[in-house]
């Protein structure tokens, strides 16, 4: 029951983080530019990954998309290749998920291909947290190291006057839902891969085992039969060791002054 | 790197009208705001006029219906056309955009060269 609960657990958790992801790689709010207000209107620039954005205190917000690769940082290249990589490595899992789910039955499946299913999909839905982190927080850094503050100088000519204005990239909310996605998507990845260790088949060797002795000089062997939950390969507890050894199944023991337990 | 280019300028007499021009040009993705600011001889910058993409228009008192701000948005053009001028109406006329040269680059100020106006009989 903890196994089951474990597991659709870290699914749901994961979706979450998943879905949180594609939002973040989708939202054009990745970095916001503080901006004095001009004499006419505020005006708001933020960017993303794909588009640049501008909103007036009006309310008209004009959008451009980035059509060209070239003039592109090759960090944002790098941040975009990432969460493309966290976000199909996530899908993949949720659907490797699905398949390994234990209160989902499908045909025959043994638990132990499920066991296998759920580390393949935790493993990926690690993987995928990691990179949607490493995607958000390489931007952030990029932000702190080449964009935190840039200065415009004016120049005005004949004037010869110089004014400067320092406009401020800060961190977009896009930021923190990637971090946030991120991290529920490694937690869930993590649970997927606890669940896994309780869905394996256990199996134990049990030492003591009724042997029938074929005579008065057959001396006892130690050893056993590897008794099995019922979800193995072992499943009919077939014999194991010859010589005079029998499982519960195969022979039915009498009492006698043989016979060691 | 965005240019901006004014023209229109000259000497005119008083009560009489210009057409002041403003053309962008270079590397542009964006220009949210473009505005008109003179200088006067002896003197500081003064707004006068500005137009966001979005139409959101705004004057100086001291030109308000006399003055009319328009741009062009498909040739990134910023006009001013000036009627009923007056002396004081002299100045260096500066065109400003408050630009981005490419979308991943803050917005920053732009500013043109100059225009000289010239109001005097």
């Known amino acids: 029951m903890a196994v089951t609960a474990c597991q659709g657990l870290g699914f749901v958790v994961s979706l979450i983080g998943i879905a949180g992801i594609i939002a973040a790689t989708c939202m054009d709010q990745w970095s916001t530019q503080d901006l004095y207000n001009n004499p006419v209107t505020a005006v708001f620039n933020y960017q993303g990954l794909w588009r640049s954005c501008v909103r007036e205190s009006s309310g008209f917000t004009e959008c451009r998309g980035y059509f060209t690769l070239l003039g592109l940082p090759a960090m944002l290249q790098a941040v975009r290749a990432l969460m493309i990589v966290g976000i199909v490595l996530g899908a993949i899992g949720l659907l490797v998920s699905i398949f390994a789910l234990k209160c989902i039955r499908i045909g025959s499946m043994e638990d132990s291909a499920k066991a296998n299913m759920t580390l393949t999909s935790g493993i990926m839905f690690i993987v995928s947290g990691l990179c949607a982190i490493a995607g958000v927080s390489v931007f952030a850094n990029m932000l702190v190291t080449n964009f935190w503050m840039s200065t415009a100088n004016m120049y005005t000519g004949m004037g010869g006057m110089v004014q400067t204005v320092q406009t401020r990239y800060t961190f977009g909310a896009a930021l923190f839902v990637g971090w946030v996605a991120g991290g529920l998507t490694l937690i869930g990845g993590v649970m997927m891969c606890i669940a896994c260790r309780g869905l394996a088949p256990e199996e134990t060797n049990y030492k003591a085992v009724s042997y029938h002795a074929s005579g008065h000089s057959v001396a006892y062997k130690p050893g056993g039969f590897k008794a099995s939950t019922g979800f193995g390969s072992n499943t009919k507890n077939k014999k194991i060791y010859d010589g005079g050894a029998r499982t519960e199944d195969e022979v039915q023991s009498y009492p006698s002054k043989h016979d060691y337990v | 790197q965005v240019q901006l280019v004014e023209s229109g300028g000259g000497l005119v007499q008083p009560g009489g009208s210009l057409r002041l021009s403003c053309a962008a040009s270079?590397?542009?993705?964006?220009?949210?705001?473009m505005t008109w600011y003179r200088q006067a001889p002896g003197k500081g910058l003064e707004f006068v006029a500005g137009?966001?993409?979005?139409?959101?228009?705004n004057y100086a008192d001291s030109v308000k219906g006399r003055f009319t701000i328009s741009r062009d948005n498909s040739k990134n053009t910023l006009y001013l056309q000036m009627n009923s001028l007056r002396a004081e109406d002299t100045a260096v006329y500066y065109c400003?955009?408050?630009?981005?040269?490419?979308?991943?680059?803050?917005?920053?100020?732009?500013w043109g060269q100059g225009t000289l106006v010239t109001v005097s009989s």
């Open positions: 137009i966001s993409k979005g139409g959101t228009s």
């Open positions: 270079g590397s542009i993705f964006s220009i949210p705001v």
């Open positions: 400003n955009a408050q630009a981005s040269s490419f979308g991943w680059m803050p917005l920053s100020d732009y």
